[in-house]
Interface confidence: low
């Protein structure tokens, strides 16, 4: 094909007339915007075919692509098509008009696209802007095609200045259609409902815009159809949601609900199922066991935890000695009940820096209109032992006594020991345990009292030593479940004044 003038780009004057000629070895034709404009076709004596396109009274609207192609070009190579681009600078035409579909650009993947805003004059400076922005975007411009690049889902306009007049193009809208491998999730407002309550399920697809939902459910199998509702959640990433709503559930509505989603562009599909249980009435059930006796350590924090299942959500109350507990403003008690799954709850009572007065009988009660459960336990406050007094005396009988007094909860054990070699014991030699009945040289008498108000035990133990012939280190050790305490006294013979 031979085109005269050859181009590939021509700038012609407005209102002028111009002739384009195309010739080839087979019939040829000029095309403009996929149409064949009026033209003169001829065949020369040498067998050459030609077509002459005369452009008269040119205006800016004549700006654009012109193609010369073989008349029967189907199946011919692309080099058998010649392209010519003509500019007709026309100050009365701003941007060339677009078909409506050119203003909406749809994509299914991230790829370069062209915003086809074109002007009649190749000398004009054209800039691209977001519709609501003044800043020019750094995108390359081709006067024959427009702006090409990777664009976000926004609205864009082109701007140019013709003389002293700023001209805006129509707005172009870029839409990225989401088509990806399907990711379906199914949620139920509740997976457990009482008969007469509603069942509401949501099937959500993320990342696709063109999908079809199909639900299967127990009612459908018996021919009772329910019409789902589909809506868009205007969000990123795209969410489409189908809602299946069954009012006034019956026991027969228990079973598996399946949402099947197909996507028509790439023919992907996925399905998810969820089980719904319709119960005759609500329930509350304790899970696991809590011992009837619980312990807390004085001045430490203690959390008491009860796990249970319930539907519908219950009210939870805690009592101490039959009086209702609430979060204390001083922060000594904290109550919390949290939902760890749809029907499973953990209720916690936290005692902060436990006091003796917090010992007592505790009850947790969980209830709703259909059912109730309660759990009770006794809380014992454990108090680390402390030795309050260790004293030595010389009664007239000639024996020597050492008295040890201490307190704690639970009841402390008392251990007496002695060191006869003050230089080496207790570092090198172990102390000797005292108070065993087999030893005649010492006797032990121990009394235990429980103090109700302080809720702790007092131990008073008296050690009688028959004959002390040299200085002796006597140690009293009190022990219970939460600690131990020791004090020591030096016992000297009657006849020996003890000096340090």
């Amino acid at each position: 094909l031979v085109v005269t003038p050859p181009g590939p780009e021509l700038v012609l004057n407005v209102s002028s007339t111009f002739v384009l000629t195309c010739s080839g070895s087979a019939p040829v034709v000029w095309e403009r915007m996929s149409q064949e404009p009026p033209q003169e076709m001829a065949k020369a004596q040498d067998g050459t075919f030609s077509s002459v396109l005369t452009l008269t009274n040119l205006t800016g609207l004549d700006t654009g692509e012109y193609f010369c192609t073989h008349n029967d070009s189907r199946g011919l190579e692309t080099d058998e098509r010649k392209r010519l681009y003509i500019f007709v600078p026309d100050p009365t035409v701003g941007f060339l008009p677009n078909d409506a579909e050119e203003l909406f650009i749809f994509l299914t993947e991230i790829t370069e696209i062209t915003i086809p805003c074109r002007v009649t004059d190749p000398q004009l400076v054209v800039t691209l802007h977001e519709k609501k922005g003044d800043v020019a975007l750094p995108v390359p411009y081709d006067h024959q095609r427009g702006f090409s690049g990777i664009f976000e889902d926004r609205s864009y306009i082109c701007k140019t200045t013709i003389g002293d007049r700023e001209v805006d193009s129509d707005a172009y809208y870029v839409y990225r259609l989401q088509v990806s491998s399907i990711n379906v999730s199914v949620n139920a407002v509740q997976t457990v409902v009482r008969q007469g309550e509603n069942i509401t399920l949501m099937c959500i697809v993320i990342g696709n815009e063109v999908v079809n939902f199909e639900w299967t459910y127990p009612r459908k199998e018996s021919g009772r159809l329910v019409e789902p509702v589909t809506d868009f959640l205007l969000d990123m990433p795209y969410h489409i949601r189908s809602i299946l709503h069954i009012p006034s559930a019956e026991l027969e509505d228990s079973g598996t609900y399946t949402c099947n989603v197909t996507e028509s562009v790439n023919d992907h599909q996925d399905e998810k199922a969820i089980n719904i249980t319709v119960v005759e009435s609500g329930y509350v059930r304790l899970l696991g066991e809590v011992g009837t006796l619980q312990f807390a350590e004085l001045h430490r924090s203690r959390t008491l935890q009860v796990v249970f299942e319930a539907y519908p959500p219950p009210t939870v109350l805690w009592f101490k000695d039959n009086r209702t507990l609430g979060d204390s403003s001083a922060g000594e008690i904290a109550l919390s009940t949290r939902n760890v799954s749809e029907t499973r709850y953990v209720s916690e009572l936290t005692l902060v820096r436990v006091k003796v007065a917090e010992a007592g009988h505790y009850t947790m009660r969980a209830f709703h209109e259909d059912a109730e459960v309660q759990l009770s336990f006794q809380l014992q406050i454990n108090v680390p032992v402390r030795v309050l007094e260790l004293s030595e005396s010389h009664p007239d009988s000639g024996e020597q006594t050492v008295r040890c007094r201490g307190r704690g909860m639970p009841q402390p054990n008392i251990i007496w020991s002695a060191c006869r070699d003050l230089k080496r014991c207790p570092r090198e030699l172990p102390p000797t345990l005292l108070g065993n009945s087999s030893e005649e040289e010492s006797q032990l008498e121990t009394n235990v009292t429980y103090w109700e108000e302080e809720q702790e035990f007092e131990v008073v133990s008296t050690l009688r030593l028959q004959h002390v012939d040299r200085p002796l280190s006597v140690r009293c050790t009190l022990r219970n479940a939460v600690g131990q305490d020791t004090q020591e006294v030096i016992v000297v013979p009657h006849s020996l004044p003890f000096k340090v």
């Epitope: 949501m202 205007l234 969000d235 949601r241 959500p313 749809e342």
Partner: nanobody
Framework: EVQLVESGGGLVQPGGSLRLSCVAS????????MSWVRQAPGKGLEWLSG?????????TYAESVEGRFTISRDDAKNTLMLQMNSLKSEDTAVYYC???????????????RGQGTQVTVSS
Amino acid sequence: EVQLVESGGGLVQPGGSLRLSCVASGFSFSESAMSWVRQAPGKGLEWLSGISSGGGRSTTYAESVEGRFTISRDDAKNTLMLQMNSLKSEDTAVYYCAKTGYCSGYNCNFAPRGQGTQVTVSS
């Protein structure tokens, strides 16, 4: 039209605290369970905490924030709150409040949600 507007984000040092608020309109707030979710840079949405509607007012938390974050609501003011204590650098994210039908375990529907508030934890 459902509208959720978060506020209270900002820059805080590790170990510090922030309190986020979310004002809701366009739906019956007192009848809706609500959640907080977040999106860290380059990551997907992470559900943090949910609170039920009605008298039970049960709360539930993701392991990553349990014991540090506390969700609460004021139905009279249509406001959802998130008290965040002992903040760590990995808590840096955009935080959104979301209207949730229900969180079944940790499987939540995160939409609709607000525009988000940026929380940056950095020394």
